[in-house]
């Protein structure tokens, strides 16, 4: 009874197409597959950034796989051939592992790379990234930003830099068509006559860094002798109403402070007949139904009513 063996895949490699972190893992079928012509061979692929504790595992019949990585670190991957039990009249047979690594060889000490990189997608419309120069770099150092997301043919360079003292310290992006709900890759590299500058890589999804505009058209409506309804409208722009959470701050007679978080554009407040003044502000944020994270908007303009009995009429600024 001869033991069934299978070779590992050939020519296993990680290919960098220049997409700033989106890499191709590819391989060729193992040698001597002739014995298993009637059989669909599968491959188990494991990969991770070096330093990560966990491997991502994929089982596929294909000869390639694509995923995003952090190019600030190296990447390691391994793959072996799987013969399903149907092919071997028994248990599954696995080859030995084929292994490969990939990294972008760094230039420059880490302190030279950009510091405090911050990207905000304003109102789900305008992306702006800003950074501080690396520590100890001279004024001749300049940084350049490149970006890519699925849908672009190749990585693009920023064309509208924000500058301070002649140095690029930020980028205003153009309209980014069909760019949300997918990984957005950025590389900021640099050059200097004085010393090599370390590149930095960043990956995020645009819907998770949205800072909306504040809500507008704040109003009061008396619902009953002891209830007032606060209302507002969603800010102008592309973000649908179902995507908002709101935080309200309410002051009664300059003393009581109420804060609340709500999911729609109204809030009912219990009041007393003695209330002489009522003010509130609202801010908005993209909620968990539309993103995994977000940034609170600025507070709205304050809406107040004072000087008349609040029970007498509808209050509208």
């Amino acid at each position: 009874d001869t033991e069934i063996k299978v070779n590992p895949p050939q020519d296993f490699e990680i290919v960098d197409p220049g997409y700033l972190g989106y890499l191709y893992l590819q391989w060729q079928p193992p040698l001597s597959l002739d014995h298993f012509k009637e059989c669909t061979v599968e491959y188990e692929l494991k990969y991770r950034n070096i330093g990560s504790e966990t491997w991502k595992t994929i089982i596929t019949k294909n000869l390639h796989y694509k995923d995003g990585f952090d190019l600030n670190k190296g990447i390691e991957a391994k793959i072996h051939t799987l013969l399903p039990w149907q092919c071997t009249n028994g248990s599954e047979v696995q080859s030995s592992w084929a292994e490969t690594t990939y990294w972008i060889s760094p230039q420059g000490i880490p302190e030279t790379k950009v510091q405090d990189m911050d990207c905000v997608y304003y109102n789900w419309q305008y992306l702006l990234c800003s950074w501080k120069p690396g520590i100890g770099v001279l004024l001749d150092t300049n940084y350049n930003l490149f970006y890519w997301y699925e849908g672009l043919d190749h990585a693009l360079q920023c064309v509208d830099y924000i500058k301070a003292d002649g140095q690029n310290i930020g980028c205003r992006f153009p309209y980014l068509e069909a760019s949300d709900y997918k990984d957005f890759y950025i590389c900021v590299n640099g050059s200097s006559e004085n010393k090599p500058i370390r590149s930095s890589y960043f990956t995020f999804q645009l819907q998770n860094i949205v800072k909306p505009l504040p809500p507008v058209y704040l109003t009061f409506t008396r619902e009953s002798s002891c209830e007032i309804k606060l209302k507002w409208s969603i800010p102008l722009g592309p973000i649908p109403a179902r995507c908002f959470d709101y935080e309200i701050e309410i002051r009664e007679d300059d003393t009581t402070l109420v804060t609340a978080t709500v999911e729609n554009e109204t809030y009912t407040l219990k009041t007393t007949n003695e209330t002489r003044q009522l003010c509130f502000v609202v801010r908005s944020k993209v909620n968990i139904y539309c993103s995994d994270d977000g940034i609170w908007s600025e507070w709205s303009d304050k809406q107040c009513w004072e000087g008349e009995d609040l029970s007498k009429k509808t209050l509208l600024r």
Partner: antibody
């Protein structure tokens, strides 16, 4: 497997210069940076500088005026030169491979004694 | 420059004991840039722990590393005779790259 081997003169006279060659095997210096570090009884481990895979260099500011690092990619060799040696430059000089913001493999070191 | 102060400078302990070496930085070091090396007499330093807490290939699991900011530690649980060596912490964050003065670990 990865190996780095330093070769130096052993004994050098004060006020002269020191040249050490680091010959590497098992990896290409076009893909990895190479650091130079020394170990002396008085000062412990001191980083002297690095030549990156692209050929650019970074030096310890304390040595920048008298250290030069260069390389020959075709021979997979890195060269370290230090001028104006004094007795307190007596040390074991190491080359080490840069990987993942560490020095993951080191040569065995070459002992340099500065004495007349 | 970032000065790394190791303590103690010499540590004498018995086989089976737990030992801790500390490394204090004069200014904050990002944890991914703080490493430990082991050096035995007549040999080159070996990368031992990288990025504060990751063991280099072949390092026994009785070693561990932790810390953040300016305070980092290397711990050996149940010391073995072959652990006798000098241990150096190292920061790769800012130029010049610097090392601690070393902790010489002796077996009683």
């Amino acid at each position: 497997q990865v190996q780095l081997q330093e070769s130096g003169p052993g004994l050098v006279k004060p006020e002269t210069s020191l040249s050490i060659t680091c010959t590497v095997s098992g990896f290409s210096i076009t893909k990895y940076g190479v650091h130079w570090v020394r170990l002396s009884p008085g000062k412990g481990l001191e980083w002297l500088g690095v030549i990156w895979s692209g050929g650019s260099t970074d030096y310890n500011a304390a040595f920048i005026s008298r250290v030069n690092i260069s390389k020959d990619n075709s021979k997979n060799q890195v060269f370290f030169k230090m001028n104006s040696l004094q007795a307190n430059d007596t040390a074991v000089y190491y080359c080490a491979r840069d990987f993942g913001d560490t020095m993951d493999y080191w040569g065995q070191g070459t002992t340099v004694t500065v004495s007349s | 420059e970032i000065v790394l102060t190791q303590s103690p400078s010499i540590l004498s302990a018995s086989v089976g004991e737990d030992v801790t070496i500390t490394c204090t930085a004069s200014s904050s070091v990002t944890s991914s840039y703080l490493h430990w090396y082991q050096q035995k007499p007549g040999s080159a330093p070996k990368l031992w722990i990288y990025s504060t807490s990751n063991l280099a290939s072949g390092v026994p699991s009785r070693f561990s590393g932790s810390g953040s900011g300016t305070s980092f530690t290397l711990t050996i649980s149940s010391l073995q005779a072959e652990d006798a060596a000098t241990y150096y912490c190292h920061q790769y964050h800012r130029s010049p790259l610097t090392f601690g003065a070393g902790t010489k670990l002796e077996i009683k």
